[in-house]
């Protein structure tokens, strides 16, 4: 919509708004140690932080959601911080015939927005 | 991942988990009355509700986010309910030369998932 403009500056202060953050997790944390061999530890980029009015709005739906949340906060939730894109990750895992490589397209976030 | 299975039954009770809900909004609510002519009122389908562990997980990222939220709730947020697809909406709006129709592909949610 030409009449609602998403913004990129965080009104809540540094690091408070929707952004990418790296979380370290082991295969044990993920419950994957029985089938994934490597890497043993993953640097998982995830989307965290708040989505104040018009901040990094994903699309028109997110813009109107933000607006309606301001009018009906009990009825309409604020937009929330979710991945806008992903970076592929290759895992080495056990198979019936030995070891195999597989690429996961939707495991590690590359960018975030408010949806 | 073959080892984390998203689920479709809500453990919190009917209507509590992530689902599509219709919110009625006027052009005035949206701040669009100066440029949109019709419809005067919109039935906006939006995604609302909670995302308990493994419920309607959007993808592998959402599954591991749910898992890590269980382990590090202060560090990793729970997945949240966002549109998985949209349904197009045609709006009639003012232009410099008169009236025009425009289709918005990302205004009204059609399905929801936890991301």
């Amino acid at each position: 919509s030409a009449h609602l403009h998403p913004r990129d500056s965080c009104p809540l202060g540094p690091g408070r708004c929707c952004h990418l953050e790296t979380v370290q997790a082991t295969l044990e944390d993920l419950g994957w140690s029985d089938w994934v061999l490597s890497p043993r530890q993953l640097q998982l980029s995830m989307c965290v932080g708040e989505c104040p009015h018009l901040y990094r709005s994903a699309n028109t739906h997110a813009l109107i959601k933000a607006r309606l949340h301001g009018l009906q906060p009990d009825r309409v939730p604020a937009p929330c911080c979710v991945p806008s894109s992903y970076t592929p990750v290759v895992l080495m895992h056990r198979t019936d015939s030995g070891v195999s490589l597989q690429t996961y397209d939707d495991l590690v976030a590359q960018g975030c927005h408010c949806a | 991942s073959a080892h984390l299975h998203p689920r479709d039954s809500c453990p919190l009770g009917p209507g509590r988990c992530c689902h599509l809900e219709t919110v009625q909004a006027t052009l005035e609510d949206l701040g669009w009355s100066d440029w949109v002519l019709s419809p005067r009122q919109l039935q906006l389908s939006m995604c609302v509700g909670e995302c308990p562990h493994l419920y309607r997980s959007a993808n592998t990222h959402a599954l591991i986010k749910a898992r890590l939220h269980g382990l590090q709730p202060d560090r990793v947020p729970a997945p949240c309910c966002v549109p998985s697809s949209y349904t197009p909406v045609v709006l009639m709006h003012r232009t410099d030369s008169g009236v025009s129709l425009q289709t918005y592909d990302d205004l009204v949610a059609q399905g929801c998932h936890c991301a």
Epitope: S38, P39, D105 | -
Partner: antibody, heavy 119, light 107 residues
Framework: EVQLVQSGAEVKKPGESLKISCKGS????????ISWVRQMPGKGLEWMGI????????IYSPSFQGQVTISADKSISTAYLQWSSLKASDTAMYYC????????????WGQGTLVTVSS | DIQMTQSPSSLSASVGDRVTITCRAS??????LNWYQQKPGKAPKLLIY???NLQSGVPSRFSGSGSGTDFTLTISSLQPEDFATYYC?????????FGQGTKVEIK
């Protein structure tokens, strides 16, 4: 500086054994996998296989399974490619490459080792 | 195994030309495709990863697109240093495979 340095060119006879090396420096060797790639004279690139130096897990392309052995010694940050019995058709340039499993690409390459097998 | 077919196998172009190289996978590989450039006597160099992401330090005249089975590498304005052989590479699942290469020569 992050780099992979490969051992020098080799001239061998058919039936002989050979082990070429690829030494990583400037980064934590066990944090990245190493792949080997073959390029026969005037030809394209062929993926041979991969090793996780931290656990020495290896995966081979079916074309190279049983023909070569990929190994690593993490104590000296070195990966190896070896043959027990060379053939004339093994004549090629062999490259090692560091694998970034985030993004899934070969980000650092060795300079290549030319292996010539001739009677 | 997934077969990667590049076209053309070679092309002649002039400095300033827009060059497009295509790569087709024998089955869907999502966006799990890289592009490498190789000059004679040198090791390959990564240009594009995940189908469309430009590797750090690579000039912006290089771009990649596509998903599924069909992919494209575009050089918007060919420079003298771009005359080389270009390879696509799939890493959707093992065994990983390269395309046969496209040689870009001076017209």
């Amino acid at each position: 500086e992050v780099q992979l340095v490969q051992s020098g060119a080799e001239v061998k006879k058919p039936g002989e054994s050979l082990k070429i090396s690829c030494k990583g420096s400037g980064y934590s060797f066990t944090d990245y996998w190493i792949s080997w790639v073959r390029q026969m004279p005037g030809k394209g690139l062929e993926w041979m296989g991969i090793i996780d130096p931290s656990g020495s897990y290896t995966i081979y392309s079916p074309s190279f399974q049983g023909q070569v052995t990929i190994s690593a010694d993490k104590s000296i940050s070195t990966a190896y490619l070896q043959w027990s019995s060379l053939k004339a058709s093994d004549t090629a340039m062999y490259y090692c490459a560091r694998v970034s499993y985030y993004g899934g690409y070969f980000d650092i390459w060795g300079q290549g080792t030319l292996v010539t097998v001739s009677s | 195994d997934i077969q990667m077919t590049q076209s053309p196998s070679s092309l002649s172009a002039s400095v300033g030309d827009r060059v497009t190289i295509t790569c087709r996978a024998s089955q869907s590989i999502s966006n799990n495709l890289n592009w490498y450039q190789q000059k004679p006597g040198k090791a390959p160099k990564l240009l594009i990863y995940a189908a469309s992401n430009l590797q750090s330090g690579v000039p912006s005249r290089f771009s990649g697109s596509g998903s599924g089975t069909d992919f494209t590498l575009t050089i918007s304005s060919l420079q003298p240093e771009d005359f080389a052989t270009y390879y696509c590479f799939q890493l959707d699942h093992s065994p990983f495979t390269f395309g046969q290469g496209t040689k870009v020569e001076i017209k």
